[in-house]
Amino acid sequence: ECVTQLLKDTCFEGGDITTVFTPSAKYCQVVCTYHPRCLLFTFTAESPSEDPTRWFTCVLKDSVTETLPRVNRTAAISGYSFKQCSHQISACNKDIYVDLDMKGINYNSSVAKSAQECQERCTDDVHCHFFTYATRQFPSLEHRNICLLKHTQTGTPTRITKLDKVVSGFSLKSCALSNLACIRDIFPNTVFADSNIDSVMAPDAFVCGRICTHHPGCLFFTFFSQEWPKESQRNLCLLKTSESGLPSTRIKKSKALSGFSLQSCRHSIPVFCHSSFYHDTDFLGEELDIVAAKSHEACQKLCTNAVRCQFFTYTPAQASCNEGKGKCYLKLSSNGSPTKILHGRGGISGYTLRLCKMDNECTTKIKPRIVGGTASVRGEWPWQVTLHTTSPTQRHLCGGSIIGNQWILTAAHCFYGVESPKILRVYSGILNQSEIKEDTSFFGVQEIIIHDQYKMAESGYDIALLKLETTVNYTDSQRPICLPSKGDRNVIYTDCWVTGWGYRKLRDKIQNTLQKAKIPLVTNEECQKRYRGHKITHKMICAGYREGGKDACKGDSGGPLSCKHNEVWHLVGITSWGEGCAQRERPGVYTNVVEYVDWILEKTQAV
């Protein structure tokens, strides 16, 4: 059962796992949610009736029954983790805490103009978990405007105390706001020889990398595969750090793989969701339950639905035994990973999918692409929407992309002459324009947010957000596309598609069926040569064939340039301007979305 509200002046008795310090009960709930075992918590707020050493304590708790006895206690705030909930969860915390000093290891001290600058510095520093900033009014002259970057083993403060004229806050890495590089490569036959901060068991290097990503201190990792010569180290995932933030030594070793934390890419690739099955593999751990199940998929479902289950092993039924049902072992451990991994015993193992909701919805795999042809099929581009105007008569106006459950990203130039959002309708999950009838459901538009530097498409800033009146329920035919990570600026995308109903201003003919065209990206330098009278800025991206043979008219203004990278689709561009439709075959010019990620997040996350 999902319980989101906090219980004031209430304490849960017993079930303690560990105690951490958090600046608020709300953040305590987030910490509990991300902890592998925590189901309930009790937070102590500052209060004259409480011992100051207990202020800001966040006690993480577990219970076999998923609940604990409640006791009345002033200043105590209790609640449940969001593990039991189905809604999207985020660790992003933009709050600034006034007059609080969050203690940790102060490893960097520098002058900053503001708390915001200090927070940005923390976000762009690989080691930083949180910061404390002494304001202009701080009594000690030599400490004024000092920005202290801090880290701890747990990622949360070791203590929190009251201190006048300082402010504290957390790194915004988990808000996708870091400019740190996103290095997705996994290096085969490589060992990073740096200090280990932790070790866990993992079935493969990808899971090891994801564990490293959500471990607060892990910057890179080394994984020993099941073929590793030393038996006791097989399937061992070593979580590592270094002072520089990079591996100091790389050793060539067969059957080992190494890689980096994906903390700067976490909004555009799954880091919590381990969805694969591992055949002929047994995961050992504390047994929670043994249930009969028809298949390993059914076993995974049972694990996902059992809130305390972290991983499972399924042993298929022996012929004609137990109505063809196998045994599903639901398991858990102190850190969410198996205590040992065994091979060759015939089991099929995997992880709960409950953690998938901690990843961005946009990372969910969509159904395979239909190769060839120019007409799309249903569900092929589930983020594509058709934006209609109802004035003077209803017609398709522009394309757009779902980027959140209340947000559509499109082009600013679509709204020339649009006086009010009331005349706009957003249709999602549409393949053919002819499907749209009087009674077809649509999303009304609450607000049009146009970039304030926009003047005309050709000058850039051709980007706009539509805030919908109601939220989109994600399904196979309507779901979001990931924004590119800022750490991905140097990625070379090779699998890019432009989609739309083929409508361009001045060309009234629209296609009934959603069209698609695979087009290569063109360097800005090459593109600039093709558009000598227009400045191709770094905030634009160009795509299209050097020479004829591909109809670049498939995209609508405002629609997506979608690129697949590491099995995840990213919204790399927004169809903006260009001469792709005419005989000229110049590349199309698109708004370069990665350059607007901060703007998008600022607008969509505004309270």
Epitope: M456, E458, S459, Q528, K529, R530, Y531, R532, G533, H534, K535, R546, E547, G548, G578, E579, A582, Q583, R584, E585, R586
Partner: antibody
Framework: QVQLVQSGAEVKKPGSSVKVSCKAS????????IEWVRQAPGQGLEWMGV????????NYNENFKDRVTITADESTSTAYMELSSLRSEDTAVYFC?????????????WGQGTTVTVSS | DIQMTQSPSFLSASVGDRVTITCKAS??????VAWYQQKPGKAPKLLIY???NRYTGVPSRFSGSGSGTDFTLTISSLQPEDFATYFC?????????FGQGTKLEIK
Amino acid sequence: QVQLVQSGAEVKKPGSSVKVSCKASGYAFSNYLIEWVRQAPGQGLEWMGVINPGSGYTNYNENFKDRVTITADESTSTAYMELSSLRSEDTAVYFCARTYGKYGGAMDFWGQGTTVTVSS
Amino acid sequence: DIQMTQSPSFLSASVGDRVTITCKASQSVSNDVAWYQQKPGKAPKLLIYYISNRYTGVPSRFSGSGSGTDFTLTISSLQPEDFATYFCQQDYSSPPTFGQGTKLEIK
């Protein structure tokens, strides 16, 4: 009808500058690019640069980059080309031209040309 | 920069002749090729754009063809007013460049 009318002939000393004007009429001035092309006596055509009157964006041929400045005044629908540090090799007929397409392309309308003579 | 090499530089022909002028680009220029006619003391006039499209008011005896790097301007039956200098131009990549010209004279 579309017309581009250029300023009259100029005689200039080496080292000085010349500014040639090109007044457009008969179309929406800010919607098309204005190019400048020159032709030395008995020679071919050489592109000097372009201006987008709508945005003010200019792009110059590397050969002239440090010496040429192209501007446009939307209020009078007039484009200007200024060439500095003149030398005798700059003696030529200077043409302004409009591009056929919004984004560049062939040059469909040309001014009558302005003869610039550089001589000491 | 893309070089446009025009040939021949000079061409003598008679009224009624069929004439062909060629232009070779130093690299592929897609379909971004135009042809101009220029008479002494006058500005160039656009004849053909996008390789083969005749500009408004240009007689049908003028035609363009080619692809990639090799392009041709053909005048099917020379008229007295066609004696002039002809230039090809690529518009594929900045800076736009012109051929050196073909002077068509009366034989």
